[in-house]
Structure formats: C-alpha cells, structure tokens
C-alpha cells in the first residue's frame, strides 16, 4: 500500500514538473509574441507615417521630374560626400541632360549663390576618361570645362552654370540624388 502511494506521489510530481515546464514554455512564447507584436506595431506605425507623409521627396529635398535632390549644408571631400549621400539612400548627383543641368544651376542660384558642389563625376587616373560613379560616360556636352592640373585624383563639381574639375581631396558642398517616390493614386 505504501509503495502504491509512493508511486502515485512520484507520478504526480512528474506531472507537476511537466506542467511547470509547459508553463515556462508558454510564458517564453507569450513574451516572444509580445516582442514581435511590438516590432510589428512599430513597423506598421513607421509605414503608416511614411504613407501619410508620402510626398515624392523627403523634407529639405528638391524635386524635379523623377528625381529628388539634396543640397548639402556642409563641406566635405569627394569620397566623404559620396558616403554622406549613401547614408541617405542616395548617390552623388549624376547629370543626364542639359535640362537637368539647367534645373540644378537655377536651383543653386536661388538657394545659395555661387559655391562649389561635388557631383558624381571622376576622372580615371589611367585613361583620363571622365565617368559617372555608376561607370557610364557623360554626354559630350556635360564634360568638365577645364582639366585640373592636379597630380592627385580629379573629380567633377558644379559652380554657377558650369561643370568643372578639381582635386578630389578639396572641400566643397555636394549634391545628392535619389528617385522620387511615385504617388500611388
């Protein structure tokens, strides 16, 4: 009889341990769900606020057709300018046409006046060819007017209504470009 009671007690204890384990698992699962829910809500909130403020360009960016432009308020060397644009999900300005060049120079005149602004153009050290940062060649009308006498790497910049060249290690403002968001009407 005592043996029977002892066996039952052991079984009960085993059951209790299993239930505690299940409860622990459930608590862990619930905590994980709550955490996921929190992330999900934050993500939804983010998406909703971006959808609510769905202008084609971010604040402080200028729109022209399919592009958004950001004119920096700080100086940096060409390579740092490029990284500053990447931080914003953009690249240094790549001028595709005379119309775009006119828009940029016109906007700069209104905003800041006659300063130097890095664009995404650099000269290959070996061949001397000018290339945009994506590897494409500029159209003939959009080549820097003067060849820099620098022994260092040479990069392109915009000043007034001209495209010029300079040592990439000099400090200038810069212009970033990204695609404008299409409004989903």
């Amino acid at each position: 009889k005592l043996l029977q009671v002892s066996t039952i007690a052991m079984q009960q204890q085993e059951k209790l341990i299993q239930q505690e384990r299940a409860l622990l698992n459930f608590t862990e699962w619930k905590r994980s769900c709550a955490l996921q829910m929190k992330y999900c809500q934050a993500f939804m909130q983010n998406s909703l606020s971006s959808a609510h403020n769905s202008s084609p360009c971010p604040n402080n960016w200028i729109q022209n057709r399919e592009s958004c432009y950001y004119v920096s308020e700080i100086w940096s060397i060409w390579h740092t300018s490029q990284e500053n644009c990447l931080k914003e999900g953009s690249t240094l300005l790549q001028i595709e046409s005379k119309e775009e060049m006119d828009f940029i120079t016109g906007s700069l005149r209104k905003i800041k006046g006659s300063y130097d602004y890095w664009v995404g153009l650099s000269q290959d050290g070996h061949s001397g060819r000018w290339l945009w940062q994506d590897g494409s060649s500029p159209s003939p009308g959009l080549l820097p007017a003067e060849r820099s006498q620098s022994a260092n790497q040479v990069c392109g910049y915009v000043k007034s209504n001209s495209l010029l060249s300079s040592n990439c290690s000099t400090w200038k403002y810069f212009i970033c470009e990204k695609y404008a968001l299409r409004s989903s009407v």
């Epitope: 992330y39 934050a42 993500f43 983010n46 990447l86 931080k87 914003e88 999900g89 953009s90 690249t91 940062q133 994506d134 590897g135 470009e177 990204k178 695609y179």
Partner: nanobody, 116 residues
Framework: QVQLQESGGGLVQTGGSLRLSCAAS????????MGWYRQAPGKQRELVAA???????TYADSAKGRFTISLGNARNTVNLQMSSLKTEDTAVYYC??????????WGQGTQVTVSS
C-alpha cells in the same frame, strides 16, 4: 542587433572571377544603402562599390568596368561580382549597410587573394 554575413572570398588567379555575397539579419527594418569596402595590408579601408535601396550604384574608379554590385531578391542581401581580378585587388572585403536609424553596420570581412 544587426548581423552581416559575408561569403565568397578565396584564392583566385589573376584575370579570374569571384562573387562575394552578404546577407543582413537581425533587428533591421530599413536599409538605405549596402556596399563593399576593402582593406589591403598597410592601407586604409576604401569604398569599392555601393548600391542604394532604389538600385542606384556607385563604384570606385578601380572597380568601374570590372565589378558589378547588385541587390538580392530579398533586398537585404548584396552581391559583388568581381571579374578581371588583379593582384592589387588582394584585400579583406567588408560588407556594410547604411540603415535608416543613421547607423552604419559592418561585417567581419572575407579575404580575397589574387595570385599571379
């Protein structure tokens, strides 16, 4: 915590090709840009190529015409196809992301050795 896992490095002959891949995981919601830097022994880390979430790419002069950067289908992976490799491409290649939380995250690096 954000993790970046690089793969694809190795030893290759001059003129050969390699494809590097990098996958971002962890608590990351929004990526602004992804890219690859490299660091050769005794040199500074330099940007090789980068691509924005919109698919706009940028290359170092040394990479133009030889390397191609692309985003994976999941948009949290980035690939660097490297061809016509030269001995001067030997370096540790680091994957990086610029996230929307203003942070830049780095991978551990993968060794690329180009032998003549």
């Amino acid at each position: 915590q954000v993790q970046l896992q690089e793969s694809g490095g190795g030893l290759v002959q001059t003129g050969g090709s390699l494809r590097l891949s990098c996958a971002a995981s962890g608590s990351i919601f929004s990526i602004n840009s992804m890219g690859w830097y490299r660091q050769a022994p005794g040199k500074q880390r330099e940007l090789v190529a980068a691509i924005t979430s919109q698919g706009r790419s940028t290359y170092a002069d040394s990479a133009k015409g030889r390397f191609t950067i692309s985003l994976g289908n999941a948009r949290n992976t980035v690939n660097l196809q490297m061809s016509s490799l030269k001995t001067e491409d030997t370096a540790v290649y680091y994957c990086t992301i610029w996230a929307r939380d203003r942070q830049q995250y780095w991978g551990q690096g993968t060794q690329v050795t180009v032998s003549s």
